[in-house]
């Protein structure tokens, strides 16, 4: 075995060789040492750093039968699928007693066709809208020059002459493909082909044209869609949730939206079956053969109030002398707004009609004029909202009050001396 004085000479009798190859290559580095006594563990260094997870194998062969005899130790480091991170200076390292021995270095290099670190990705873009594509490649050998291609046509006269890592596209009007060639001294590598799909631009100026209690008419201006005509537009409406609040640009409404499709042109749509006096948010997107545009921001809209759709229910009218007691219940039909009150009309056979605003009460006591001998007295009631009166109930005749019939005490309403205004009799 190699010997020196008390500080030993290097035990290495074989040092790592050199490997140079293309990416993906598999190779082995080997070092051999001869030591006296117990064989040490061989460590591998790359650029002076111990490789903790090295794929290495160690073989030990005794050269005699005594424990003090020499051993041959061989360590092999396997490099599978060579990558740039594998390149560098490799050495073997052993600790013998309190001494550290490092072999002569071997070198691992990478040389081959360019390797893509970044390639153009598929994406969608709105028509006539600028965007960027990225491509990055490396050797060795360097330099690596890039050449961009659009629909297989080079965008520069030669590699390295046009845009390099980033390609700025000012806008497209049709779906196109882009790829990138990387050139170095070893040859050419071609990137994946990215498909850039041209979608319609987001519609603009979504607005209300007209409003009804249960329908809204909306219109918008379509965006550019390149060479692809719009096939239809889709409108979504959702009930506004004050708790959530749909902010502009918020991704999705809190509940399932009401979706309607509009043939185009015209870029207008009547949304029906809505609730009256209700806040909604609406948005629109338009579609071509290439796909849909992005949605517009949510636009807050509101249906107006309507009049009640039915008359008050269960009207009863009883008479006791000069007093008449009338009561009713809220209409069962939709109110289509906020109930503001009730109107009551009564009329005798030969007397003019009297019209009264009762407010929100659902009962009234009428003080009839004279001795109460007005004959064939009938009463009608209608509910009203800010939008107006709902339908009047059918005339209800005044029944005579019979003893034993309960008649609660009610606030008396004096019959006005002259009618407030006249209502045409039905």
């Amino acid at each position: 075995a190699p010997r020196g004085t008390q500080a030993e000479e290097s035990p290495f009798v074989g040092n790592p060789g050199n490997i140079t190859g293309a990416r993906g290559l598999t190779g082995t580095l080997r070092c051999q040492l001869q030591v006296q006594g117990e064989p040490p563990e061989v460590h591998w260094l790359r650029d002076g750093q111990i490789l903790e997870l090295a794929d290495s194998t160690q073989t030990q062969v005794p050269l005699g039968e005594d424990e003090q005899d020499d051993w041959i130790v061989v360590s092999q480091l396997r490099i599978t699928s060579l990558q740039l991170s594998d390149t560098g200076q490799y050495q073997c390292l052993v600790f013998l007693g309190h001494q550290t021995f490092v072999s002569q270095p071997g070198y691992v290099g990478l040389e081959g066709l360019p390797y893509f670190l970044e390639e153009p990705e598929d994406r969608t873009v709105a028509a006539n809208t600028p965007f960027n594509l990225s491509c990055q490649a490396q050797g060795p050998p360097e330099p690596v020059d890039l050449l961009w291609l659009q629909d297989a046509v080079p965008l520069a006269t030669a590699p390295g002459h046009g845009p390099q890592r980033s390609l700025h596209v000012p806008g497209l009007n049709k779906t196109s493909s882009f790829s990138c060639e990387a050139h170095n001294a070893k040859g050419v590598t071609t990137s994946r082909t990215a498909t850039i799909t041209v979608l319609p631009q987001q519609p603009r100026n979504l607005h209300l044209v007209s409003r009804q209690p249960t329908e809204l008419e909306v219109a918008w201006t379509p965006g550019l869609s390149g060479i692809y005509p719009l096939t239809h537009c889709t409108l979504q409406a959702v009930l506004s949730d004050d708790g959530m609040g749909i902010q502009a640009g918020e991704p999705d409404p809190p509940e399932e939206p009401l979706t309607s499709q509009a043939s185009v042109p015209p870029h207008q749509l009547r949304l029906g079956s809505l609730h009256p006096h209700t806040p909604y948010h609406i948005r629109v997107a338009c579609t071509s053969s290439q796909g849909p545009s992005s949605w517009t921001h949510w636009l807050p809209v509101e249906t107006p109030e309507g009049v009640p759709l039915g008359p008050p229910e269960n009207i009863s009218a009883t008479r006791n002398g000069s007093q008449a007691f009338v009561h009713w219940q809220e209409p069962r039909a939709p109110l289509q707004g906020t109930l503001l009150g009730y109107r009551l009309a009564y009329q005798g056979q030969d007397t003019p009609e009297v019209l009264m605003d009762i407010g929100l009460r659902q009962e009234v006591t009428l003080e009839l004029q004279g001795d109460g001998s007005v004959s064939n007295l009938t009463v009608c009631v209608a509910a009203y909202t800010a939008a107006g009166d709902g339908p009047w109930s059918l005339p209800v005749p005044l029944e005579a009050w019979r003893p034993g019939q309960a008649q609660p005490v009610h606030q008396l309403v004096k019959e006005p001396s002259t009618p407030a205004f006249s209502w045409p009799w039905w």
């Epitope: 003090q68 390292l93 600790f95 007693g97």
Partner: antibody, heavy 118, light 101 residues
């Protein structure tokens, strides 16, 4: 030529801390471990442990675990011995010594005398 | 740990005399791991013989070492005045230990 030069003598009170340096020259510092050896007054040599200068890993003999710490300043080719909470029995001369294969110690520092007195 | 016992603990010698110091190990050690040091009064120890029988650089040829297993010895073939010192054996087979000198 190879040299190990240690810091000068130290006079300390019980409970204090001392840090002794050992500067190496004339060889590649990280290729040889550094041993520390204690010699009490009038006594023999006692191995305290060593530090692997390549990876910085210390090893302590059983009697020197706890209050004793080996460290390195590789860029300055210097090894250190620190003794915390000094006791009277820590008095003596401390040597650094270069380690070789088969655990021999081929070069020694001149020694650093540590006196502990209240 | 392996205990090393040196004998004699002290000895007087005359110039020209042949001196032998023994070192007995409490359990067997490989001869590769037995070393000898010389320490003169007021000086650091100095490596004298390594791996049982190899002379360290600069050590006169009158020094020699031998042994195996548990029994090792250091011999000064012809004693000289400059050889007055304490001699330590040291083993590195397990936890490092020195003889008492």
């Amino acid at each position: 030529q190879i040299q190990l030069v240690q810091s000068g003598p130290e006079l300390k009170k019980p409970g204090e801390t001392v840090k002794i340096s050992c500067k190496a020259s004339g060889y590649t510092f990280t290729n040889y471990g550094m041993n520390w050896v204690k010699q009490a007054p009038g006594k023999g040599l006692k191995w305290m442990g060593w530090i692997n200068t390549y990876i910085g890993e210390p090893t302590y003999a059983d009697d020197f675990k706890g209050r004793f710490a080996f460290s390195l300043e590789t860029s300055a080719s210097t090894a250190y011995l620190q003794i915390n909470n000094l006791k009277n029995e820590d008095m003596g001369t401390y040597f650094c010594a270069r380690g070789t294969t088969f655990y021999a110690m081929d070069y020694w520092g001149q020694g650093t005398s540590v006196t502990v007195s209240s | 740990e392996i205990v090393l016992t040196q004998s004699p603990t002290t000895m007087a010698a005359s110039p020209g005399e042949k001196i032998t110091i023994t070192c007995s190990a409490s359990s067997s050690i490989s001869s590769n791991y037995l070393h000898w040091y010389q320490q003169k009064p007021g000086f650091s120890p100095k490596l004298l013989i390594y791996r049982t029988s190899n002379l360290a650089s600069g050590v006169p040829a009158r020094f020699s070492g031998s042994g195996s297993g548990t029994s090792y010895s250091l011999t000064i073939g012809t004693m000289e005045a400059e050889d007055v010192a304490t001699y330590y054996c040291q083993q590195g087979s397990s936890i490092l230990t020195f003889g008492a000198g």
